[in-house]
Interface confidence: medium
C-alpha cells in the first residue's frame, strides 16, 4: 500500500488587496481524516472538523472565508500576510499530516511615475 | 436560566445498561454541543463524549461499542452497556467542550452504582 | 491521541500563597485550553476557558497563561474557599482520545 503524504499548491502567489486559496489534498483513501488545521506560523486560522463543521479563529473571521471543501480562502490580502501556512491532518489511526504552501503578497503594481520638464 | 439536570436509576446489575437523561433548559441543543463526563468516587474526571449541534457524536477511545450518546428536543441520553463495578461513579452532563467557551454549566452529577 | 499531564498532583499551601499549577499536553492544542475546580461532593466549575480568559464571577486572583503545549493556573493569593481540586481540559481533538481532562491537582491546607 501507498503511504499517505499531503499534497499541496507549494508556493503562490497573489495581488495585495485580492484573494488566495490555500490548499492541501491527502492522498490517501486508507486513513480517517478526523479534523483539519490551518495555521500561519504558530498562528491557528482556522480548525475544519470532518463532522462538526468549521471553527474560524476569531482574529481571522473577517479575513478568512471556509472552503471550497478543506481548503481555505484568504481575503483582503496585505504584504504582511506573506508567509508560510500550514495544514494540519489529524487522522486515525496514522497520526498527524502536515504541508507547507508558501505566500507571496505582492504589492500593488501600479506605481505613480512623475516626469519633469525643464522649462527653457 | 441555563439548567442541567440528570436522571436515571442510582443502581444498575452488571452486564446491565446503564441509562441516564440530562433535561436541560435555557438553551436550545440545536445550538449547543454537550458532553458527559463520569467521577469514579475518589478518582478524577473522565470524559465519555460529545453530541454536536448536528447531532453528530464522538466516544473516549475506552467507551467506543459500549455507550451510545443521543438528543431530543431538551434531553441528551446517555447509554452505556455491558457495565461492571469499574463503571460506578458519579454521572455528570456539561453544556459545551468541543472549541468553545469551556463546559459551562454542569449538571449536579448522579451517582450510579453498579452492583448486583 | 492528546495526553493531558498535570503537575503536582497534590500540593500543600498556606492562605495568602502564590499558587500555580502547570498542564502539558502532548501536542500542540493552541489556546483550546479550560481549567476547573471541584470541591468535594461538587460538580466541577469553570474558571478560565481559551487558556487565559477568565469565566463569568470568577474572582481575578485567578489567572491562566500560555499556549500550544505548555498551560499555567495561577493564584495569586490563596483563599480558604480555594482549597479543592483542579483540573485542566484539552477542547482541541474530540476524535479518537481517551481522556479530554488532566488527572487532576489537589490543593490543600498547609
Known amino acids: 500500500t501507498m503511504a499517505s503524504m499531503i499534497v499541496t499548491t507549494g508556493n503562490i502567489s497573489a495581488e495585495e488587496g485580492g484573494s488566495a486559496i490555500l490548499q492541501c489534498h491527502l492522498s490517501s483513501t486508507t486513513t480517517e481524516v478526523t479534523q483539519v488545521n490551518w495555521e500561519q506560523q504558530d498562528r491557528l486560522l482556522a480548525v475544519r472538523h470532518v463532522d462538526l463543521g468549521w471553527h474560524i479563529s476569531p482574529a481571522f473571521k473577517e479575513r478568512v472565508v471556509p472552503g471550497p471543501s478543506l481548503s481555505l480562502t484568504l481575503l483582503a490580502l496585505t504584504v504582511n500576510d506573506t508567509g508560510e501556512y500550514f495544514c494540519t491532518y489529524h487522522t486515525y489511526p496514522d497520526g498527524i499530516y502536515k504541508g507547507r504552501i508558501f505566500l507571496e503578497v505582492r504589492g500593488s503594481s501600479v506605481a505613480e511615475h512623475s516626469i519633469g520638464f525643464q522649462i527653457p | 436560566q441555563v439548567q442541567l439536570q440528570e436522571s436515571g436509576p442510582g443502581l444498575v446489575k452488571p452486564s446491565e445498561t446503564l441509562s441516564l437523561t440530562c433535561t436541560v433548559s435555557?438553551?436550545?441543543?440545536?445550538?449547543?454541543?454537550m458532553s458527559w463526563i463520569r467521577q469514579p468516587p475518589g478518582k478524577g474526571l473522565e470524559w465519555i463524549g460529545i453530541?454536536?449541534?448536528?447531532?453528530n457524536t464522538y466516544y473516549a477511545n475506552w467507551a467506543k461499542g459500549r455507550v451510545t450518546i443521543s438528543k431530543s428536543s431538551n434531553q441528551v441520553s446517555l447509554k452505556l452497556s455491558s457495565v461492571t463495578a469499574a463503571d460506578t461513579a458519579v454521572y455528570y452532563c456539561?453544556?459545551?467542550?468541543?472549541?468553545?467557551?469551556?463546559?459551562?454549566?454542569w449538571g449536579q452529577g448522579t451517582l450510579v452504582t453498579v452492583s448486583s | 491521541d492528546i495526553q493531558m499531564t498535570q503537575s503536582p498532583s497534590s500540593l500543600s499551601a498556606s492562605v495568602g500563597d502564590r499558587v500555580t499549577i502547570t498542564c502539558q499536553a502532548s501536542?500542540?492544542?493552541?489556546?483550546?485550553l479550560a481549567w476547573y475546580q471541584q470541591k468535594p461532593g461538587k460538580a466541577p466549575k469553570l474558571l478560565i476557558y481559551?487558556?487565559?480568559t477568565l469565566a463569568s464571577g470568577v474572582p481575578s486572583r485567578f489567572s491562566g497563561s500560555g499556549s500550544g503545549t505548555d498551560f499555567t493556573l495561577t493564584i495569586s493569593s490563596l483563599q480558604p474557599e480555594d482549597f479543592a481540586t483542579y483540573y485542566c481540559?484539552?477542547?482541541?481533538?474530540?476524535?479518537?482520545?481517551?481522556?479530554?481532562f488532566g488527572q487532576g491537582t489537589k490543593v490543600e491546607i498547609k
Open positions: 456539561a453544556r459545551g467542550g468541543y472549541r468553545t467557551s469551556g463546559m459551562d454549566p
Open positions: 481540559q484539552q477542547e482541541h481533538l474530540v476524535a479518537w482520545i481517551y481522556n479530554v
Open positions: 453530541i454536536g449541534s448536528n447531532g
Open positions: 435555557g438553551f436550545s441543543l440545536s445550538s449547543s454541543y
Open positions: 501536542q500542540n492544542i493552541y489556546s483550546d
Open positions: 481559551r487558556a487565559s
